[in-house]
């Protein structure tokens, strides 16, 4: 059976069909256990250092949001009135918006333990890993052991509120030239 605790770094060597293959033992997200903080700098706390989103390819991340992530957020929120939650989290520029998006998407909060397994979160993680220089390394470095067993997804009202905040942050990310309200 699968081990409950996995080692994030471990890769196993196999012979493949003519090519070469090394299979990662742990194919779950590495996740993050940092709690939600507000930052206006575009920096994310990650262990002893911060990830700076300044050099991301914002246009490609925006395209990924518009083509797919936005639809997954809408699907998650289906059945919820758009006026049900007030937007209380804001961001001032694109790096700051990504900082807040990263924090709300991947960091556990009271009442909403994890959104990280949701499709919009997986896609967000992929977009950041692909188009933010060095971001993927910060994820590999999140080596704290994590349960391999998938937690049952529970859509709480708090999670819906959090995803509503995320929709607002993404909308703001897409309109960087607008003056802060």
């Amino acid at each position: 059976g699968l081990n409950d605790i996995f080692e994030a770094q471990k890769i196993e060597w196999h012979e493949g069909g003519g090519g070469s293959e090394q299979k990662l033992i742990s194919e779950e997200d590495l996740g993050s256990s940092h709690h939600h903080h507000h930052h206006s700098s575009g920096l994310v706390p990650r262990g002893s250092h911060m990830y700076d989103f300044t050099n991301c390819d914002f246009e490609k991340i925006k395209a990924a949001y518009l083509s797919t992530i936005s639809k997954d957020l809408i699907t998650y929120m289906s059945g919820t009135k758009s006026t049900e939650f007030n937007n209380t989290v804001s961001c001032s520029n694109r790096p700051h918006c990504l900082t807040e998006i990263q924090s709300l998407t991947f960091n556990p909060t009271a009442g909403c333990a994890s959104l990280a397994k949701e499709m919009f979160a997986m896609k967000t993680k992929a977009a950041l890993a692909i188009w933010c220089p060095g971001y993927s390394e910060t994820q590999i470095n999140a080596t704290q052991a994590m349960k391999k067993r998938r937690k049952r997804k529970v859509t709480t009202n708090k999670c819906l509120e959090q995803v509503s905040q995320l929709q607002g942050l993404w909308r703001r990310f897409n309109r960087p030239l607008l003056k802060q309200q």
């Epitope: 890769i11 493949g16 090519g19 070469s20 293959e21 090394q22 299979k23 990662l24 742990s26 194919e27 779950e28 997200d29 590495l30 050099n55 390819d57 490609k60 395209a63 990924a64 083509s67 797919t68 997986m122 896609k123 993680k125 992929a126 977009a127 890993a129 692909i130 188009w131 220089p133 060095g134 993927s136 390394e137 994820q139 590999i140 470095n141």
Partner: antibody, heavy 120, light 107 residues
Framework: QVQLVQSGPEVKKPGSSVKVSCKAS????????MHWVRQRPGQDLEWMGT????????DYNQNFKGRATITADKSTSTAYMELSSLRSEDTAVYYC?????????????WGQGTLVTVSS | EIVLTQSPGTLSLSPGERATLSCRAS??????VHWYQQKPGEAPRLLIY???QSISGIPDRFSGSGSGTDFTLTISRLESEDFAVYYC?????????FGRGTKVEIK
């Protein structure tokens, strides 16, 4: 077990196009990007671009932009790399390689390579 | 584009000797460097990822170190099957790039 099986060798005329396939099996196709890397005879490795099934998008090395098109058919877990306006210097072995996009983030499995020869 | 410069181009050593391969990046890339081994007619094989992360199934005589711009692959005691070409690759940002390779040959 994970396998990336590429299409067979091709001989092409200058100015024509070639489309190489890479059939993936043994893993969840959308959890990985598929990268394409080429190696000219006796030369080093050159990254061409990638297709990210999870985001349904591709990204390219500017050296190949406009000539290379990287796509995938998620229903068959097959990635494709098409290179147009071929010239003799495109003679190379073309490799596909998977890379995790939500974990691992490294090219940990490679196809066996497809030799494309461009000759008049 | 990030340029990776590998040195030396060729390393002539005997089995049992220690091999030290260098990879220098044209700009800071943290630890986003991976090392591959390639033998004639074969696809590259991943040895080390993110500068120093080892892979089970790869002999522990292979180790990696470095961060920022300078990276090293060390083979502590060369075995006959280790004579091959070694490439470093960066995944810090697009376009991904490879070094030109170091050939480790039998002296």
């Amino acid at each position: 077990q994970v396998q990336l099986v590429q299409s067979g060798p091709e001989v092409k005329k200058p100015g024509s196009s070639v489309k190489v396939s890479c059939k993936a099996s043994g893993y969840i196709f959308t959890d990985y990007a598929m990268h394409w890397v080429r190696q000219r005879p006796g030369q080093d490795l050159e990254w061409m671009g990638t297709f990210i099934p999870l985001l349904d998008t591709s990204d390219y090395n500017q050296n190949f932009k406009g000539r290379a098109t990287i796509t995938a058919d998620k229903s068959t877990s097959t990635a494709y790399m098409e290179l147009s306006s071929l010239r003799s210097e495109d003679t190379a072995v073309y490799y596909c390689a998977r890379m995790g996009v939500t974990h691992s983030y490294v090219m940990d499995a490679w196809g066996q390579g497809t030799l494309v020869t461009v000759s008049s | 584009e990030i340029v990776l410069t590998q040195s030396p181009g060729t390393l002539s050593l005997s089995p049992g000797e220690r091999a030290t391969l260098s990879c220098r990046a044209s700009q800071h890339i943290s630890r986003s460097v991976h090392w591959y081994q390639q033998k004639p007619g074969e696809a590259p094989r991943l040895l080390i990822y993110f500068a120093s992360q080892s892979i089970s199934g790869i002999p522990d005589r292979f180790s990696g170190s470095g961060s920022g711009t300078d990276f090293t692959l060390t083979i502590s005691r060369l075995e006959s099957e280790d004579f091959a070409v070694y490439y470093c690759q960066q995944s810090y940002s697009f376009p991904y790039t490879f070094g030109r390779g170091t050939k480790v040959e039998i002296k």
